[in-house]
Amino acid sequence: AILGRSETQECLFFNANWEKDRTNQTGVEPCYGDKDKRRHCFATWKNISGSIEIVKQGCWLDDINCYDRTDCVEKKDSPEVYFCCCEGNMCNEKFSYFPEMEVTQPTSNPVTPKP
């Protein structure tokens, strides 16, 4: 059973390592894959002394941990590298950090990337 599934056909693309990887730095990435597999968008970033440094954004392969996520939100407490994934076109355009610890109340830190 799959409720309210949103198709992902394209994602915001960004690669901080674009020169070394020989890719574009930024743009829109069409998401390809087997027709029976789901596609997602992702974002990964670092927080260097309070400054957000985007590492990569783009398409992400079928992953059950991305199902039913309409927003790109990292919920892990204090990760080294922040990661989120989501379903829906360009859903990784905005991403946020919303740590959910077991006891304490979460605080939201939305991020709008400006690559």
């Epitope: 059973a1 309210g4 789901r38 392969l61 079928d62 059950i64 941990n65 959910e100 077991e102």
Partner: antibody, heavy 118, light 111 residues
């Protein structure tokens, strides 16, 4: 420390029902997809069912479709497997497993034994 | 119906190297199936060894490594030790909510 504790196993007659529970702690349950995997006596591991973070998407292996229902209560940090119309071939240890990105099982419970016999 | 195949059994000498493989009947295994590997000793829950083809899980010694060999996923154990004697399972993520386990390989460490 991540802990997954299954319960609800036992002896049941063919055609009967059981509900397994998996109590999760040590991680943010509502942020993890979850799965059930079983192992018949002396046999290999078999994936049974999976569920997305919200519970909005559920999946089953063909042999249990229409008989088993996976669900989750994110407010109680608990995963469930409702098993109806049980058959002898459902006899197994049932493990609950946490699923991480790249869709792999990163933590496992110790399992609960389900025996279907008359 | 997808069937994932593993060698039913394998033997290795202490200190030796062994490579277990994981293939399937519907074509080649690639990294997009996100192969993962699990170790299980009798009476115990499985333990995660490798995910995303070649990433070691936390606490797993670097004697264990994962790769794609030809059209199969592979788990290589170098410098085999007595306590590596276990059952090893590969899992392929088929996508759309479905996983398939291999039948498992029973590894015997000789001596």
């Amino acid at each position: 420390e991540v802990q997954l504790l299954e319960s609800g196993g036992g002896l049941v007659q063919p055609g009967g029902s059981l509900r397994l529970s998996c109590a999760a702690s040590g991680f943010t349950f509502r942020n993890s997809a979850m799965s059930w995997v079983r192992q018949a006596p002396g046999k290999g591991l078999e994936w049974v069912s999976g569920i997305s973070v919200t519970g909005g998407s559920t999946f089953y292996t063909d042999s249990v479709k229409g008989r088993f229902t996976v669900s989750r209560d994110n407010s109680r940090n608990t995963l469930y497997l409702q098993m109806n119309s049980l058959r002898a071939e459902d006899t197994a240890v049932y493990y609950c497993a946490k699923v991480y990105y790249y869709s792999f099982f990163d933590y496992w419970g110790q399992g609960t034994l389900v025996t279907v016999s008359s | 119906q997808t069937v994932v195949t593993q060698e039913p059994s394998f033997s290795v000498s202490p200190g030796g190297t062994v490579t277990l493989t994981c293939g399937f009947n519907s074509g080649s295994v690639s990294t997009s199936y996100w192969p993962s590997w699990y170790q299980q000793t009798p009476g115990q829950a499985p333990r995660t060894l490798i995910y995303n083809t070649n990433t070691r899980s936390s606490g797993v010694p670097d004697r264990f490594s994962g790769s794609i060999l030809g059209n199969k996923a592979a788990l290589t154990i170098t410098g085999a030790q007595a306590d590596d004697e276990s059952d090893y399972y590969c899992v392929l993520w088929m996508g759309s909510g479905i996983w398939v386990f291999g039948g498992g390989t029973k590894l015997t460490v000789l001596g």
